[in-house]
């Protein structure tokens, strides 16, 4: 059963992780990029299922993909290069799903703009905060 | 509701410069758009040629990238083509168009009516 | 330079279902967008991001993607559906845009 010191380290981390991603949609949000709509036309692919940490799976296969849409972003309303922002994100969704877990990730027929992706992945870390707290 | 209407001559002689202007009514040029020039050649299909962003930053298609040149100016609400350098080939009907806001799909929402552009001496 | 490949022609009975295709190395990830041409007209959108109906579109009209295919699909073809047909897509990155080169459709 997991231990009070373990869920509240798994609150910060999902709190960290719902940081960054807001971080990134404020990002690109900035209606001052030309950029954003050429972003729009990059297709993310969407978990079928993201209830559980083990469905971060789903999100971190499309990291690599984010990255390269961040990189042709040529913000600079990032604080870390799109590269190091990637990898933080990376180790906090490794640590929350677990690195030994072996779940095959499910994605919908419908893919997404960055941006529902974004949205959709940060609604995920809001909801598994709630049931935390 | 955008609008859009091109204007400039309709014959331009070989080797000389082809020059069209869109007119942006209904909305401002300086939203979160990029503004589009496309041609279509008699009986031929749809071929984009560049864009600009109110900021003046541009993309071009690589094919014609040497020869165009496409400028904004926002004080008039409109934006511009020059094509240098025009054969025959050139001879088409070019259409201005246009994407809606950020936030809604990309693409063109908004088309001109298009101006047919004769390329002959 | 980048290309999206689409059949010239496509002919159907009306009431029947067409089904146009287009082709490109970047729709994995790269959104498709369809224009409707009628003679003498200006194109007008009727599909954006792969799937989804702008609005005034007619439900018969629809899009899926798959791997590097996008497929423009019109249920019950009417003859007002007589038109150009072109997919619309951008590179992988980003900054270049390009349409297929068209398909013409043919309600007999």
């Known amino acids: 059963a997991p231990t009070s010191s373990s869920t509240k380290k798994t609150q910060l981390q999902l709190e960290h992780l719902l940081l960054d991603l807001q971080m990134i949609l404020n990002g690109i949000n900035n209606y001052k990029n030309p950029k954003l709509t050429r972003m729009l036309t990059f297709k993310f692919y969407m978990p079928k299922k993201a209830t559980e940490l083990k469905h971060l799976q789903c999100l971190e296969e499309e990291l690599k993909p984010l990255e390269e849409v961040l990189n042709l972003a040529q913000s600079k309303n990032f604080h870390l290069r799109p590269r190091d922002l990637i990898s933080n994100i990376n180790v906090i969704v490794l640590e929350l799903k677990g690195s030994e877990t072996t779940f095959m990730c499910e994605y919908a027929d419908e893919t997404a703009t960055i941006v529902e992706f974004l949205n959709r992945w940060i609604t995920f870390c809001q909801s598994i905060i709630s049931t935390l707290t | 509701q955008v609008q859009l209407q091109e204007s400039g001559p309709g014959l331009v002689k070989p080797s000389g410069t082809l020059s069209l202007t869109c007119a942006v009514s209904g909305g401002s040029i300086s939203s979160s758009n990029w503004w589009s020039w496309v041609r279509q050649p008699p009986g031929k299909g749809l071929e984009w040629i560049g864009e600009?962003?109110?900021?003046?930053?541009?993309n071009y298609n690589p094919s014609l990238k040497s020869r165009v040149t496409i400028s904004v100016d926002k004080s008039k609400n409109q934006f511009s083509l020059k094509l240098s350098s025009v054969t025959a080939a050139d001879t088409a009907v070019y259409y201005c168009?246009?994407?809606?806001?950020?936030?809604?799909?990309?693409?063109?929402?908004?088309w001109g009516r298009g101006t047919l552009v004769t390329v002959s001496s | 330079s980048y290309e999206l490949t689409q059949p010239p022609s496509v002919s159907v009975s009306p009431g029947q279902t067409a089904r146009i295709t287009c082709s490109g190395d970047a729709l994995p990830r790269k959104f498709a967008y369809w224009y409707q041409q009628k003679s003498g007209q200006a194109p007008v959108m009727v599909i954006y991001?792969?799937?989804k109906r702008p609005p005034g579109i007619p439900e018969r009209f629809s899009g899926s993607s798959s791997g590097t295919m996008a497929t423009l699909t019109i249920t019950g073809a009417q003859v007002e559906d007589e038109a150009d047909y072109y997919c619309?897509?951008?590179?992988?990155?980003?900054?270049?845009?390009?349409f297929g080169g068209g398909t013409k459709l043919t309600v007999l």
């Open positions: 600009i962003y109110h900021s003046g930053s541009t």
């Open positions: 991001e792969d799937s």
């Open positions: 168009a246009s994407g809606t806001e950020v936030g809604a799909p990309h693409g063109f929402d908004y």
């Open positions: 619309y897509s951008t590179d992988s990155g980003g900054d270049v845009s390009v």
